[in-house]
Structure formats: structure tokens, C-alpha cells
Amino acid sequence: MMTGTIETTGNISAEKGGSIILQCHLSSTTAQVTQVNWEQQDQLLAICNADLGWHISPSFKDRVAPGPGLGLTLQSLTVNDTGEYFCIYHTYPDGTYTGRIFLEVLESSVAEHGARFQIPHHHHHH
């Protein structure tokens, strides 16, 4: 039975040209995290494998940095970066946990972070 929950940075906003940290945290489970995948809508951005370390998609290497921790740092933000981001935790023996973050990239300096919130665990992505 899957007992875990994923806490994420929730709905966040940032300024165009700036950077933002996407963070997820898996709690309430003793399952072993084997890999974390970061996805932007329908694109795979990065993989952090417990045995093999971080690997960033070649098409995003110039703007995506690993960390801190299992999080992901997006740099040189553009308005096109606005949208949904997913952290997918592959765990043993539980299976897959998915967290969702919505990022809005703003032209002005009105950007501010949303409150942290919890997403109930679920097995299927999207």
C-alpha cells in the first residue's frame, strides 16, 4: 500500500530572466527512492538516479542545473517556461509518486512565491 505524500513548492512565480528552484519532498513512507524524474508538461528535463547521479537533458543543459538536493534549478527564465512541472519519484516497493508545480514567469517584478502545499500521493502520472 502506498502511504507517502509529496510536498512541493506549489504554485510559484518568478521574473523573466531570473531563476527558480523547483522542490519536491517525499514523506510518510519508508520506500527507497531509486530515481527522480523532472518533467515540464510533455518533456523530460532531468533525471536523478540514486546509483548514477544527475543527468540533464542535452536540450536543456544550458538552462537547467541539478539541485539543491533532489530539486531542480531553472535559469534564464522566459515567458515560455510558464506551465506545469512534475517531479516523479520512482520508489521501491511503493511505485511512482508524482508532485505538480505550476510556474508563472512574469514580465514585471511582481513575482512572488506561493505557499507550500501537499499533494496526496497517486500512482499514475498526468
Partner: antibody
């Protein structure tokens, strides 16, 4: 020029072990993964496992765990794949490949391993 | 393990015509799919990575598309040197499984 040069063909008896080497050149050995893939006659390509030569971290396909060991020697930029308790079904061409983001952009020439009594 | 199912098993196409190969993943793999060309007696060659990115030096008649579970490799105008077996591979999660291969021949 990136190159992966593998050791020569091997003929082994059932129950024996084989160790295949893969010497890398033309790039920073510790900056990329080395993956091992095999192809038995008439079969699809089969991923066996991978090593991060920088950290020494490994990951193996479940069916090979306990029977395969992948190592890397940073000083000689060489990776090794040792498969033990050989059986006839292990007869295959074994490839090493450079792993970039878990896809394989350069491949060795392949090493034929024949298991026969 | 994620199962990659390729179709068709073989394909005969006239020179200059389009060849389309499909690959279906048994579960979501985002854009974590690569395509390889494998000729007899040679090592496989990378054509496409991350579903749609053409690898360096690969002719632009090769293209890839798809996301999630359904992926396609297209050869827009088949050349004689394209005769080979083509494999999809998911690089989303270990073990990094391959499809069964599609043999492309000249009609």
C-alpha cells in the same frame, strides 16, 4: 575522436566466467556513463547494466544481479563487464556504449561470447 | 520493467518513399525515447534521442516524434543505405529496455 575498443572474442564452457573490457579514448572518461548491452542470435538488444566511472555507482538489470559485475578503472579509462555462471543462453554479442543522459551515443565494436560445452 | 513494443516487425518501402516505424511504451516515459539503426556486422548507431532530437551528423530525412507512450521514427525518403534494423529504447528509467526491432528493406 571518441572511441570504445573492446576485447576479443571468447569461447567459454558452461559454468565459467567471462570478463570483457572496453577501453575509452577521445573524451573525459569520468564525465559519461558506460553501459553494457548484449544481443543474442535472433534476439532484440538487451540492456544489462551501467556504471558511472566518476562515482563508481552501478545499476544492473534485475535478471543479471548476482551474476554480472561492472567496474571501471579511471587510470586506464577502461570499463569491464564480468558475467559468471555462464550458460548457453549467454551466447551473444556484448557491446559497451557511452551513456549520455541514458541513451548511447558511441558504441564499441562488440565482443562475441560463445558458451559451449 | 517498461516494455517497448515496435510495429511493424518488418517494412518494405520503395526508394524515395516514406518509412514509418511505431513504438509503444507499456507506461509513461515522457520524451525518454531514443532510436538506433543497426546494420549486420556493425554496432548500433544513435539516430534520435529525447524522442525528437536528431543526433549530430544524422541526415535530416530521419525524424522522431511522440511523448508519453506513443513514438514514431520517420524516414522521409528511403535511401539504399537505410536498409537496417531500427530499435527504439526508453531512457526514462532503468532497466533501459529496447523494442523488438523493425527490419527495413527495399521494395
Amino acid at each position: 575522436e571518441v572511441q570504445l575498443v573492446q576485447s576479443g572474442a571468447e569461447v567459454k564452457k558452461p559454468g565459467a566466467s567471462v570478463k570483457v573490457s572496453c577501453k575509452a579514448s577521445g573524451y573525459a572518461f569520468t564525465n559519461y556513463l558506460i553501459e553494457w548491452v548484449r544481443q543474442a542470435p535472433g534476439q532484440r538488444l538487451e540492456w544489462m547494466g551501467v556504471i558511472n566511472p566518476g562515482s563508481g555507482g552501478t545499476n544492473y538489470k534485475e535478471k543479471f544481479k548476482g551474476r554480472v559485475t561492472i567496474t571501471a578503472d579511471k587510470s586506464s579509462s577502461t570499463a569491464y563487464m564480468e558475467l559468471s555462471s555462464l550458460r548457453s543462453e549467454d551466447t551473444a554479442v556484448y557491446y559497451c556504449a557511452r551513456g549520455e543522459y541514458f541513451f548511447f551515443d558511441y558504441w564499441g565494436q562488440g565482443t562475441t561470447v560463445t558458451v559451449s560445452s | 520493467d517498461i516494455v517497448m513494443t515496435q510495429s511493424p516487425d518488418s517494412l518494405a518501402v520503395s526508394l524515395g518513399e516514406r518509412a514509418t516505424i511505431n513504438c509503444k511504451a507499456s507506461q509513461h516515459v515522457s520524451t525518454g525515447v531514443a532510436w538506433y539503426q543497426h546494420k549486420p556486422g556493425q554496432s548500433p548507431k544513435l539516430l534520435i534521442y529525447s524522442a525528437s532530437y536528431r543526433y549530430t551528423g544524422v541526415p535530416d530525412r530521419f525524424s522522431g516524434s511522440g511523448s508519453g507512450t506513443d513514438f514514431t521514427l520517420t524516414i522521409s525518403s528511403l535511401q539504399a543505405e537505410d536498409v537496417a534494423v531500427y530499435y527504439c529504447q526508453q531512457h526514462y528509467n532503468t532497466p533501459h529496455t529496447f523494442g523488438g526491432g523493425t527490419k527495413v528493406e527495399i521494395k
